[in-house]
């Protein structure tokens, strides 16, 4: 499957289906990842206007925050994006979905922070192992999107310096037990797994021991699979436009899709005086579609030159990927040129905008 251009493809995104209303879904994302929250309508069909809220404040769409009626994407997430997110019905403010999002450090490889937590001479004559950074070990459940890197750490000390070994689901865990292997960094008391997959789910236990004793800590890893979805169109685009007769107009449509999307621009038309067919589908004509030499960038813009009154009406940006369609529509209003307005005023006529 072609992934298309970087600006459109959201790398390492976890699409999280919305929990039942009333439930709060606890989610953990890595720094730099795309947080993607999904709140499908109860019936799979339209659910009316919605708003996304973070910590009680409505989210404003931006280059980084993509707000759709059923999905929210926060690109390149950072710690500041942690918080309580909810999708609400605009009119009633009823909470449809509720998520608790935490963005943590999830380095793309296990090599940063080297040197931290290394075995150190504590000055203690002899002693059983103990945790040197227990505050770094309080997150027992880690839920990460597939393809991310996971690092489990058990910083410890003791005299003599203890050894560390790892178990998965209670059994010895070695590199040959997973495709892609593992990195054991004894100096950092860590286990690193790159590009995690669903089969990596399970309980991981570090066992730290010396001749005076043994301590252990168990972490639970959940790997969130990416779920396919229809293209996401940026909220507010295309935007309604008002133009003067003879001027040029541009409609914009920003499409985000894992799979290469098809993009088309449609104009709504009337057939035998009707705007919709017998099944309620609007009658449309295709204005712009992918051609041999058309780039996706070009398809995201519809340009209308020297507009006439016939150009007024409803326009739709239609995007489709491997599993479905998404669309956003906007209206173009064409006003008479200023000279015509002046003449009309002198004649005592009134034009409705």
């Amino acid at each position: 499957e072609s992934l298309g251009t970087e600006q459109r493809v959201v790398g390492r995104a976890a699409e999280v289906p919305g929990p039942e209303p009333g439930q709060q879904e606890q989610l953990v994302f890595g720094s730099g990842d795309a947080v993607e929250l999904s709140c499908p309508p109860p019936g799979g069909g339209p659910m009316g206007p919605t708003v996304w809220v973070k910590d009680g404040t409505g989210l404003v769409p931006s280059e980084r925050v993509l707000v759709g009626p059923q999905r929210l994407q926060v690109l390149n997430a950072s710690h500041e994006d942690s918080g309580a997110y909810s999708c609400r019905q605009r009119l009633t403010q009823r909470v449809l979905c509720h998520f608790s999002v935490r963005v943590t450090d999830a380095p793309s490889s296990g090599d940063d922070e080297d040197g931290e937590d290394e075995a150190e001479d504590t000055g203690v004559d002899t002693g059983a192992p103990y945790w040197t950074r227990p505050e770094r070990m309080d997150k027992k459940l880690l839920a990460v999107p597939a393809a991310n890197t996971v690092r489990f750490r058990c910083p410890a000390a003791g005299n003599p310096t203890p050894s560390i070994s790892w178990l998965k689901n209670g059994r010895e865990f070695r590199g040959e037990h997973r495709i892609g292997g593992i990195k054991l960094r004894h100096q950092q008391w860590s286990l690193v797994m790159e590009s995690v997959v669903p089969s990596d789910r399970g309980n991981y236990t570090c066992v730290v021991e010396n001749k005076f004793g043994s301590i252990r800590q168990t972490y639970t890893l959940d790997v969130l699979e990416r779920s396919p979805h229809r293209p996401i169109l940026q909220a507010g685009l295309p935007a309604n436009q008002t133009a003067v007769l003879g001027s040029d107009v541009e409609f914009h449509c920003k499409v985000y899709s894992d799979a290469q999307p098809h993009i088309q621009w449609l104009k709504h038309v009337e057939v035998n005086g009707s705007k919709v067919g017998p099944d309620g589908t609007p009658y449309v004509t295709v204005l712009k579609t992918a051609g041999a030499n058309t780039t996706d960038k070009e398809l995201e813009v519809l340009s209308l030159h020297n507009v006439t009154f016939e150009d007024a009406g409803e326009y739709t940006c239609l995007a489709g990927n491997s599993i479905g369609f998404s669309h956003h529509s906007a209206w173009l209003v064409v006003l008479p040129a200023e000279e015509e307005l002046v003449e009309a005023d002198e004649a005592g006529s009134v034009y409705a905008g």
Epitope: T281, I323, G324, F325
Partner: antibody, heavy 124, light 107 residues
Framework: QVQLVQSGAEVKKPGSSVKVSCKAS????????ISWVRQAPGQGLEWMGG????????NYAQKFQGRVTITADESTSTAYMELSSLRSEDTAVYYC?????????????????WGQGTLVTVSS | DIQMTQSPSSLSASVGDRVTITCRAS??????LAWYQQKPGKAPKLLIY???SLQSGVPSRFSGSGSGTDFTLTISSLQPEDFAVYYC?????????FGQGTKVEIK
């Protein structure tokens, strides 16, 4: 009332081809995705492939790749499924099914409307 | 391809019984799951989509639940017209795939 009406039963020889039609009445044909699903006698349902007329694109199941061709004629609101190199195990009822339209739920492969089925018998 | 596994493959029940059919996907499919009912010689009929949404015109005794990999179709009180074959179907991934079917027979 939107309907999908399929062509009649066919009896074919092994090695030959069959072309089944599916005409949509009472709807805006190109706005929907049309798929073909088959069911061998006493067996389950199997998706063969689908076409999205508005984009002019088709997808096929790996199993049928190279043997099946799905086309659509927007002027007559008709979809076609042609299966070549027929063998006895292709004996089945072939259904056309309508997936999501761009103004409905939008999922190409969520079928809410089916044709009545066309029995294709492959026998020497 | 995503494999859909239904259980049981057949069941016998009486009118008025509560019937549950389960479906498991070989990998997560979010809520992209539908249930179809098929009677002999007829085309399948959509009952449930988006895992739990009732298709219009379908009696409310049919309900669906689940998300991810495990899904359930429940018929709260079996009626004579409900004896049929039921298929689960995932539509969120190419190729879309059906379960092998569950035949609900009269006891």
């Amino acid at each position: 009332q939107v309907q999908l009406v399929q062509s009649g039963a066919e009896v074919k020889k092994p090695g030959s081809s069959v072309k089944v039609s599916c005409k949509a009445s009472g709807g805006t044909f190109s706005s929907y995705a049309i798929s073909w699903v088959r069911q061998a006698p006493g067996q389950g349902l199997e998706w063969m492939g689908g076409i999205i007329p508005i984009f002019g694109t088709a997808n096929y199941a790996q199993k049928f790749q190279g043997r099946v061709t799905i086309t659509a004629d927007e002027s007559t609101s008709t979809a076609y499924m042609e299966l070549s190199s027929l063998r006895s195990e292709d004996t089945a009822v072939y259904y056309c099914a309508r997936g999501g339209g761009w103004v409905s739920h939008g999922y190409y492969y969520l079928f809410d409307l089916w044709g009545q089925g066309t029995l294709v018998t492959v026998s020497s | 391809d995503i494999q859909m596994t239904q259980s049981p493959s057949s069941l016998s029940a009486s009118v008025g019984d509560r019937v549950t059919i389960t479906c498991r996907a070989s990998q997560g499919i979010s809520s992209y799951l539908a249930w179809y009912q098929q009677k002999p010689g007829k085309a399948p009929k959509l009952l449930i989509y988006a895992a739990s949404s009732l298709q219009s015109g379908v009696p409310s005794r049919f309900s669906g639940s689940g998300s991810g990999t495990d899904f359930t179709l429940t018929i709260s009180s079996l009626q004579p017209e409900d004896f049929a074959v039921y298929y689960c179907f995932q539509y969120g991934s190419i190729p879309p795939t059906f379960g092998q079917g569950t035949k609900v027979e009269i006891k």
